[in-house]
Amino acid sequence: LADPLDHRDAGDLWFPGESESFEDAHVEHSISRSLLEGEIPFPPTS
């Protein structure tokens, strides 16, 4: 599946409890990014 969110900009993680982030880190924690970087959700059958 194509990645609808670009992954060139790596934002810092947010500090829980703060009212504001230092960066917008949603792209780094998006569904799209997980498809690029994560384990294969359904391994291919042999």
């Epitope: 609808p4 934002g11 993680l13 947010w14 009212s19 230092f22 949603h26 997980s34 994560g38 959700p41």
Partner: antibody, heavy 114, light 112 residues
Framework: EVQLVESGGGLVQPGGSLKLSCATS????????MHWVRQASGKGLEWIAH??????????YYAESVKGRFTISRDDSKTTIYLQMNSLKTEDTAVYYC?????WGQGTTVTVSS | DVVMTQSPLSLPVTPGEPASISCRSS???????????LYWYLQKPGQSPQLLIY???NLASGIPDRFSGSGSGTDFTLKISRVEAEDVGVYYC?????????FGPGTKLEIK
């Protein structure tokens, strides 16, 4: 294929409770930040809750309109997020979407009425 | 809260003609790393919202390059170079930088 499927909506009386679920599939779930966004009929989008990942200690954030009444949670083993809604008000009537901000579910309708 | 405003709220467009929607935030959405946390969504009639543009100017996957996003820290524009019938719906801008996250009121694009 990425899927986000909300369920649990329905008709509830003011002051009542309801628990929404959002079952996800088709992507590695554990590191994804998830949200609930709602939309009253004919109105705009309102973000109401956000939950981060285990690596972020499952930090949660809420809109003032639902703080203290709604609770967002997640079960990584079931790749599902939840929205526990208590002390419901008529103004909570809306379609509730779960989203990763890039992908959205189809929504589930909550009606609060006596 | 960060207030997001949009104009116009209603936009009748002739197919094939360009269209432009403005969005303004009550505070800067530009981060120290040069990322601007401004997103555009389209909600077609009877459907869920779909992501068009993220971080102000990045086109989401599967979105035609007729769509483009631009702007500064507080003033943003979504442009459609040539409107097609399938573009009808409500366009929302949103910020995901400061809690609570907020959406604009929406711009309803309709075909003349």
């Amino acid at each position: 294929e990425v899927q986000l499927v909300e369920s649990g909506g329905g008709l509830v009386q003011p002051g009542g409770s309801l628990k929404l679920s959002c079952a996800t599939s088709g992507f590695p779930f554990s590191n994804v930040w998830m949200h609930w966004v709602r939309q009253a009929s004919g109105k705009g989008l309102e973000w109401i809750a956000h939950i981060k990942a285990k690596s972020d200690n499952y930090a949660t954030y809420y809109a003032e309109s639902v703080k203290g009444r709604f609770t967002i949670s997640r079960d990584d083993s079931k790749t599902t997020i939840y929205l526990q809604m208590n002390s419901l008000k008529t103004e909570d009537t809306a379609v509730y979407y779960c989203t990763g901000l890039d992908y959205w579910g189809q929504g589930t309708t909550v009606t609060v009425s006596s | 809260d960060v207030v997001m405003t949009q104009s116009p709220l209603s936009l009748p467009v002739t197919p094939g003609e360009p269209a432009s929607i403005s969005c303004r935030s009550s505070r800067s959405l530009l981060t120290s790393k040069g990322i601007t946390s401004l997103y555009w969504y389209l909600q077609k009639p009877g459907q869920s919202p779909q992501l068009l543009i993220y971080r102000m100017s990045n086109l989401a996957s599967g979105i035609p390059d007729r769509f483009s996003g631009s702007g500064s820290g507080t003033d943003f524009t979504l442009k459609i170079s040539r409107v097609e019938a399938e573009d009808v719906g409500v366009y929302y801008c949103a910020q995901f930088l400061v809690y609570p996250y907020t959406f604009g009121p929406g711009t309803k694009l309709e075909i003349k």
